[in-house]
Every structure is written in structure tokens, then in C-alpha cells.
Amino acid sequence: SNNSFTNFKLATELPAWSKLQKIYESQGKTLSVKQEFQKDAKRFEKLNKTFTNYDGSKILFDYSKNLVNDEIIAALIELAKEANVTGLRDAMFKGEHINSTEDRAVYHVALRNRANKPMYVDGVNVAPEVDSVLKHMKEFSEQVRSGEWKGYTGKKITDVVNIGIGGSDLGPVMVTEALKHYAGVLDVHFVSNIDGTHIAETLKVVDPETTLFLIASKTFTTAETITNANTAKNWFLSKTGNDPSHIAKHFAALSTNETEVAKFGIDTKNMFGFESWVGGRYSVWSAIGLSVALYIGYDNFEAFLKGAEAVDNHFTQTPLEDNIPLLGGLLSVWYNNFFGAQTHLVAPFDQYLHRFPAYLQQLSMESNGKSVTRGNVFTDYSTGSILFGEPATNAQHSFFQLVHQGTKLIPSDFILAAQSHNPIENKLHQKMLASNFFAQAEALMVGKDEEQVKAEGATGGLVPHKVFSGNRPTTSILAQKITPATLGALIAYYEHVTFTEGAIWNINSFDQWGVELGKVLAKVIGKELDNSSTISTHDASTNGLINQFKEWM
């Protein structure tokens, strides 16, 4: 692969890496956050950063409970400079082909360029094209939501079914759930899994006369999506007198393969496309977000884009010391590579954000789950945290036990909106939620020593069981309210955190070769499942499983 963006092969070659190694040994591994607060009355002041969104709303990022001090932060920033994170960032924002293994630009940031400033890829200003897609989405979503767009019997659309997988599903699912408060006109459903149950259960609850299907597949060849789409089409035709002319009113495509879209029976006027510089896991900002625009309305969708654009502006214009996503990424590297942390917990204290960790899981793990650098050599360091999470307070009653008292260091992000969309019972629920948000981060930091445990009456062998070591790092993210703009900003924050990690590890965060092998083998095995012969072409385990399956199927 051609890589002209970085001049180092491995992050371990960088002087700041060795410096951080020494700092970790001399102070990092014994650093006590509790003591750091005692030493420095201005620690919170210095280590919290407030992001102001385009609409004036704010998000506070509190990094002060992390295992860092001034010297560590300075060394991490030095590492970012040596790794030329800003150079790679600027190359991305200039539309250069930073996805070196696929020789593509990485330009999802151009999708939220609502300032309409010129943004170039290969000499083409793509801003007018992006704007044109959004105009098409606006017109279409407003027609459907207003009832002007009618189904084949003249009834207005009541339900939208998005059929897609991976980036064509996770983003829209997460965002529609997160912004449910802004919906009201349409119901939206998502079908992703090839398991027939997913489409079957969805088709049970929708009416063919009032349902619009969105087939989301860039190439219109994704096996799972096209299989589900054909099942939906066959169901639709079987319920509507087998008249293919009705398809045009009930199916739209989020794709770039005009030929296949037309072959399927979809009117190409109802085809919403995006360019090759949009990666799947970065595509919710594109036409793939049509289900979002239909659900919450185009104006809210645009606010979502503008929230992300505001973070883009912050990321590109803010000095490193105050650059919020950059600091988030640097902390991740600090824990991953110097503390040996292998996971990253994201716990939203917000039920609307219940799919946010799943979305971030793809964003982070598909981007940075790589072991070869841009210099085409295997890394000699850990990359790609295992990201997981569930909404709190539920999570407190499941895996938080391990976070508090387990043997692993689990850097955690806690997310809360100060204002609830549902301030019921005189805000009782919200206050309880918030008290847990604050308490969990505090408890993880301060812990509980043997003295306190004994003072509380515990004796003998029970004492060590009740001890909390504390000093477990958290970043608290406090938003004013989960609005479309806030959500856009939060996603963009994590995109740029992921970018920063990948830039320092010198990996290509924008390909996904790891998804290919399984797909190829599944095609081979798929053919073997079509006949009744005993299979012996694989290893003994795979043969045994296939043959047992065929016997039982």
C-alpha cells in the first residue's frame, strides 16, 4: 500500500513513546487520582473541557478522574505531535486518500459540511453534490411525512422498514432510538440479520398498503440485505395482487448501483446515493440516514449534521492541549499501551442511548481492530480496545461489579444529559439517575480502604471482600440535553477519538479486510448445504458441525 502520510513504521519508534514508558514506570503506575486532587486544587478546572455546539448548547468532558498529571498530558501531546496526528487529520479534511489500502479518501466529514465550504476530492468540490443529496432527502422525507406521498391504494405511509446491515443498520437504529423523543409521524423498523426471524417478525406488524421499505446497500449486492429485500418484495407482491408496478410507491434504495436497483423494480428517482469516500461505519450522515430524516424530520436531521460539523470545527481548529477528541484518544492510548488495559466501557446514563455502545463498538473495533501499520509491518503493541457498554443504571446491576472490584483496569466513559426529555414525578427519576452517574465515577476513583470497611463494622475474612481499590479511571461526559445536535456532536467526538488512536498506532482505521474471509467461506459452505451429501472438505470440526446440522435441519 502507498503511504505518504506518516514517516514512521511503528509507534514504539517514537521518542515520546519511550518517554511515556519511563513516566509510566516512575509515576504512572503508582499515580493516585485521589492524591492528585489533594495536591492540585485546580485539577478539575484544568482537566475539564466544555464544548459549545453550533446552537449554543454545551457538553462538558471531565477528564480529571483519569490517571494523568500535567507531565503525562504533556508527554501524550508530544506523542501526538511526533505521530503527526494533525497532519493526518488535515489530510483527511483535505480529501486526500488516507485510506491507503483501498486508495480512497475518507470524507464522511464532508457529509456534514453545512457551511457549504468547498471540500475537494480528486480535484472535485463535492460540497454541491452533498448538498444535492440532502435536498433530495429533504424533499422525499417531507413528502412522506406530510402524507403527500401515498401508497398504491392512496393511503399515507405509516411505517418505514430499513433493510440493511452493519453501517447501513447500526447508525440509523442507534440514532432513531436516541432521538425517539423527536419522532411522532412515522414508525420505523430495522431488519438486519439474515436470520429469517428478523424479517418475519417485522412483516407481522406492518401493513403493505402503508409501509415504505428502504433497501440500504451501497453496492446492492450485500448478501444478507438483498436476501431480506427479496423476501420483503415477495411478501409485498403476495399481499398486493402480484402487481410489480406497486413497488415504486413502497420501495426506495440507499445505494449507488443503479442497474441492480432498477432490476429490483425500484424507480431510480427514489435512489439515494453516496460516494466511495463514505465508509459504512461513517455513513449515518449520508443517504443511509434517510430513515432518520423520515423518523425525526429533515430539520432535526440537519441539526444532527450540524452538531457533528461543530465537533469537526473544534477538532480541526483547537490547539492540542484543549482539543477534546484528541485528548480522549490520547487517554485511550495511555491506558491501552502503558497500563495494558484491553477494554473501554461506555455507559450512557440514558435509556434513549441504549444502542450507543453497540454503535461505538463497530466504530471503534472495526476501525482499529488492526495489527498491521501503514508501514506494512505488524505492530509490536496493542491496538483496538474491546469496547462494550450498556445503559446505566442497568449496568450497575450486571458488569459494574467487575469494573469496581475485578482484576482488570477498565477505563470508562459515563454519559448523562442534565435535562431529561421525561422529567416525570417532579424529576425524581432524573435525580436518581444523576446521583448514580456522579456516585459511580466517584466510587471508582476513591474506592474504600480496609479502615473504612472495618469502621463500618466488618470483621475478619469479610474485610477484604468489601475493600474497593479505587483509582479506576472514568471520563464523565455531561450534556445539557440529548438533542439531535448533541447526539451528532457525541458521535463525531468518538469518531475523532477513534481517528486519534489509529493515527498514533499508525494503522489504517478506514478499511475492514477482517470481514472478508468469513464471507468467502460462507459462500462455499452455502452451496454445500444445498445437497444431502456428507461433507468432508473441511477440518473435522467444521465437517462434523455441518453434517450434524444437515441431519437435524
Epitope: V124, E129, T256, E258, T259, A262, F272, F274, A287
Partner: nanobody, 117 residues
Framework: QVQLVESGGGLVQPGGSLRLSCAAS????????MGWYRQAPGKERELVAR???????DYAVSVKGRFTISRDNANNLVYLQMNSLNSEDTAVYYC???????????WGQGTQVTVSS
């Protein structure tokens, strides 16, 4: 900035052939449907031929079988091969690009085709 530059027009005798070219720059060419329109003096501009981003073609009834539209995505070019020309084909021929995913279009300046003996 966006440019569509037509070439290949000129004077040709009835029954003759011409090949028009349109060089596009400043657009994501492969994502555009490209077309040729023409306008004869005192008449409305009319579609002659169109090729979608996927390569499907459409022709005006009056030119079907005589004209062929093609595209070269690697070089951002669209062609109109015109055979068996007659005086009815005399017009200014305009190159047109229509973005496949939204309401965005561009026009060239036009090239004159005159069929006369």
C-alpha cells in the same frame, strides 16, 4: 469549478457522420447521468440521448438507430456518435450532466452542428 466542454461539431453533408465529445471537470463524473440536448433555431431545446451512471441509454425517437451515446468514466468523457445525418439534425448540441442522487445539473456552452450540402 465545473466545466462541460463540447467539441466535434461542424459542417457535414447529409448522410455523413460526426462524433461529438464532452469533457467534464469538477464533478464526480461516474455519479452523473450524462446527456446530449439540441436546440434548432426557433425551437425548444430537446433531449437527444442520455446515459445513466449505470450505463443505461435512452434516445429521442428521431435519432434512434442513428446516434449512439457512450461514456468513458476513466477520462470523464461522454461521446455522441451521429450517423446518417440529415438537415433536421442541424442545431446547437449541448452537453448536460445530472447528478444521480439529487437535483444538481450542469450545462455546456454548446457546439454547432450544421447538416447541409
Amino acid at each position: 469549478q465545473v466545466q462541460l466542454v463540447e467539441s466535434g461539431g461542424g459542417l457535414v453533408q447529409p448522410g455523413g457522420s460526426l462524433r461529438l465529445s464532452c469533457a467534464a471537470s469538477g464533478i464526480t463524473f461516474s455519479s452523473y447521468a450524462m446527456g446530449w440536448y439540441r436546440q434548432a433555431p426557433g425551437k425548444e431545446r430537446e433531449l437527444v440521448a442520455r446515459i445513466t451512471s449505470g450505463g443505461s441509454t435512452d434516445y429521442a425517437v428521431s435519432v434512434k438507430g442513428r446516434f449512439t451515446i457512450s461514456r468513458d468514466n476513466a477520462n470523464n468523457l461522454v461521446y455522441l456518435q451521429m450517423n446518417s445525418l440529415n438537415s433536421e439534425d442541424t442545431a446547437v448540441y449541448y452537453c448536460h450532466s445530472q447528478y444521480s442522487y439529487g437535483p444538481l445539473e450542469y450545462w455546456g456552452q454548446g457546439t454547432q452542428v450544421t447538416v447541409s450540402s
